[in-house]
């Protein structure tokens, strides 16, 4: 019996087609992805093959103005329109709190939403009961397939799930659910979830009875043969893991941003064992036409977005200096504003010993593309912020050793004075440079804000200590020459859309007046 698994993950509000780098589409003839194009390809496959499941491995939420405005209603509507069969909860599904998950998505989705390792307690337990499930048995033709969900147990540090959801260890939580499916005579089981490729592989290895793992979170691109675009494969598709009980378990993921549609064909024997598995992600490029009906619907929903862009988010009573003359040479108040917003967006009081889990922010000055003039009645709009942060990036959470941070700050000024983008703006950091010294030895003082303290204060950076830092995904991926971050990071979790982070902060503060205050000397 043959099953076709179509899968997406980490779509992050890319409902419309995008450029090849998943930013805003500028030249339509070269654009990719989007739900209208995805639907065309999905329908093509549904028409050609008998047993097809369309699955999503989480993080539909967060990433563009679509999410900012529609808050998840767009996800439910278009996933329903595409007739998804199941979705696993990702960490970003909790970005607007549990209510922001329940109302727009859980109550509106026609498909099951899954996670076996999230357990509700207290008053939430009855409110959320039945709205998400640990597993679902799906009939496919004359057979049945069990889908069991999982979500990153780091979610409380990455999003806003509140205090009434417990995120258990994935493997510990999955095993009894898979065992239950086996007692129900379900012998074909897919683990669908959002914990990253390393955990996906562990699940394939450790959870007895799981036949296939469909993952997300780490934006992993797997491919067999010559890859069709810019993404470099982390391995073959599917990635085969030998389980502890000797089975060959295919593990797949489909990069991110709706650029690819994962396509995996699995052949099962009559006892539900995987005989063979093959496939590849399908690049959703302009050779695949956008479905006119879905496209028309997208255009209808788009209208509200254009109106939103020009509405006032808040006010500034000072000039927000985002000029390259400032931000690439010295501390600039736009950099301070953005870093303050980044830390504010990551306030998670999950431990009494810590005032917060993260206190530090770094931001490449070259990523700040425009100032905002306060003389326009002080008004700040989404449109203004889109000029400051035009690249559609995210502000991510990484874990770095102090020694890596020291290298990063040396790189920040290794060729100071040439108006290059690697000059770092900061938050929760006090850095002193001596530019008379030779490159690689210019950082004379580097103090960082404590986290394990009730009164935050600055302490010298310790080379061997591991620190959490918020930074743009561009830096996490080694951009602007920060190869040491990419090579030496110990953990990387993608965060919220950059503009959304700053706009939320401005809306919360209502009136802002960021100063230059001696963070960089």
């Amino acid at each position: 019996w043959e099953l076709t698994i179509l899968h997406t993950n980490d779509v992050h509000s890319r409902l419309e087609q995008t450029s090849e780098d998943s930013s805003k589409c500028v030249n339509a003839s070269r654009c990719m992805g989007g739900v209208a194009r995805l639907f065309t390809k999905v329908q093509q496959i549904r028409r050609a093959e008998p047993n097809v499941l369309l699955l999503d491995a989480g993080d539909q939420y967060q990433g563009t103005i679509w999410f900012t405005v529609y808050k998840g209603a767009e996800v439910a509507h278009f996933m329903n329109a595409l007739r998804y069969d199941a979705m696993a909860l990702g960490n970003h599904e909790f970005d607007n709190g549990v209510e922001g998950l329940i109302e727009p998505l859980l109550k509106e989705a026609k498909f099951p939403i899954l996670s076996a390792n999230i357990k509700a307690k207290g008053p939430l337990a009855s409110q959320i009961s039945g709205l998400y499930l640990p597993y679902k048995v799906l009939p496919v033709g004359d057979e049945v397939v069990g889908i069991v969900g999982y979500t990153s147990k780091e979610t409380p540090f990455l999003s806003n799930p509140g205090t009434n959801l417990v995120f258990e260890d994935e493997i510990t939580a999955l095993q009894p659910e898979v065992d239950k499916l086996k007692t129900l005579n379900v012998n074909k089981i897919i683990a669908l979830g959002h914990s990253g490729f390393e955990m996906d592989k562990l699940i394939a290895q450790k959870v007895r009875g799981v036949d296939v793992v469909v993952g997300g979170h780490s934006n992993t691109f797997l491919y067999t043969g010559n890859p069709p675009s810019k993404e470099v494969p982390a391995g073959k598709y599917p990635f085969i893991v030998t389980s502890d009980d000797g089975r060959k378990v295919p593990v797949v993921q489909a990069y991110a941003f709706g650029k690819y549609l994962g396509y995996l064909k699995i052949e099962f024997d009559e006892r539900g064992n995987v005989i063979s598995s093959h496939g590849n992600p399908i690049l959703l490029n302009s050779s695949i036409p956008e479905d006119p009906s879905i496209k028309a619907d997208i255009n209808k929903w788009r209208i509200k977005l254009d109106n939103y862009s020009t509405q006032e988010l808040g006010k500034t009573i000072v000039y927000l200096d985002g000029s390259s003359q400032s931000c690439r040479f010295r501390e600039c108040n736009m950099g301070n504003l953005i870093c303050d917003a980044m830390i504010n967006n990551n306030l998670r009081h999950t431990d009494e010993m810590f005032w917060n889990h993260v206190s530090m922010c770094i931001l490449n000055g070259g990523g700040i593309r425009s100032p905002i003039d306060e003389r326009n009645n002080g008004t700040i709009t989404w449109e203004n912020l889109a000029a400051v942060l035009p690249f559609g990036g995210t502000f991510d959470l990484v874990q770095l050793k102090g020694s890596t941070l020291k290298k990063a700050f040396e790189h920040s000024v290794h060729r100071y004075g040439q108006s290059t983008g690697e000059f770092l703006q900061v938050g929760g950091i006090h850095v002193v440079y001596d530019l008379s010294r030779k490159p690689g030895d210019r950082v004379v003082k580097l103090d960082v804000l404590c986290t394990k303290c009730r009164v935050p204060s600055y302490d010298p950076l310790k080379m061997d200590e591991v620190y959490k830092v918020i930074l743009p995904n561009f830096l996490a991926n080694g951009g602007d020459g920060f190869q040491m971050i990419k090579d030496e990071l110990l953990r990387h979790d993608s965060g919220d859309q950059d503009i959304n982070v700053v706009s939320t902060y401005i809306s919360k503060m209502k009136v802002i007046y960021p100063a230059v205050e001696g963070r960089i000397k």
């Epitope: 329908q43 028409r47 498909f111 799906l138 009939p139 033709g141 004359d142 049945v144 009906s293």
Partner: antibody, heavy 121, light 107 residues
Amino acid sequence: QVQLVESGGGVVQPGRSLRLSCASSGFTFSNYGMHWVRQAPGKGLEWVAVILYDSSNKYYPDSVKGRFTISRDNSKNTLYLQMNSLRAEDTAVYYCARGGSSWYPDSFDIWGQGTMVTVSS
Amino acid sequence: DIQMTQSPSSLSASVGDRVTITCRASQGISSWLAWYQQKPEKAPKSLIYAASSLQSGVPSRFSGSGSGTDFTLTISSLQPEDFATYYCQQYNSYPLTFGGGTKVEIK
């Protein structure tokens, strides 16, 4: 082979009740949504009810809502339509039809031969 | 409710003719449209689903097209066994609704 066979039709007085059955064979009945569709003499097709594969949801058009109840017994591979408060306009051939394997609306790939229901005094 | 309007309601054609039947939905239904053939005193038979997919066992002279609100069923070369009534049906949302039918008669 895949087959649907309806039974239980007949002549009934207005206001009375009737129960139709549809026996299935040749496929995994419990995996499919099942529908009733009717056709009044000389008229077109009208959808009457659906029950999802797991009985989790049932849907009806306004014309029969509150009067007709669809049910299924997966252990017997049988679909039912309980028709109460019958009216003259319910006179039709009633077909049972197989839908899809999910909770989304679907088309019908397999049809029974139909059973005639006549509501007349 | 979504109304389905079929045209023409009847047509006369000869064996070998190309026949086109149209179906219009009162609102967008994407490609969630099916076509059925019904002969007198018989149950309907599924021809096409998802607007353009041929049900297995259906001759390739039948084809469907369209998306959104406008759909077409085409019989490329009418055969004697094709004289029947044809219905479209939307399955975008409940309640499921059918077109009024198109009777294809021998000229």
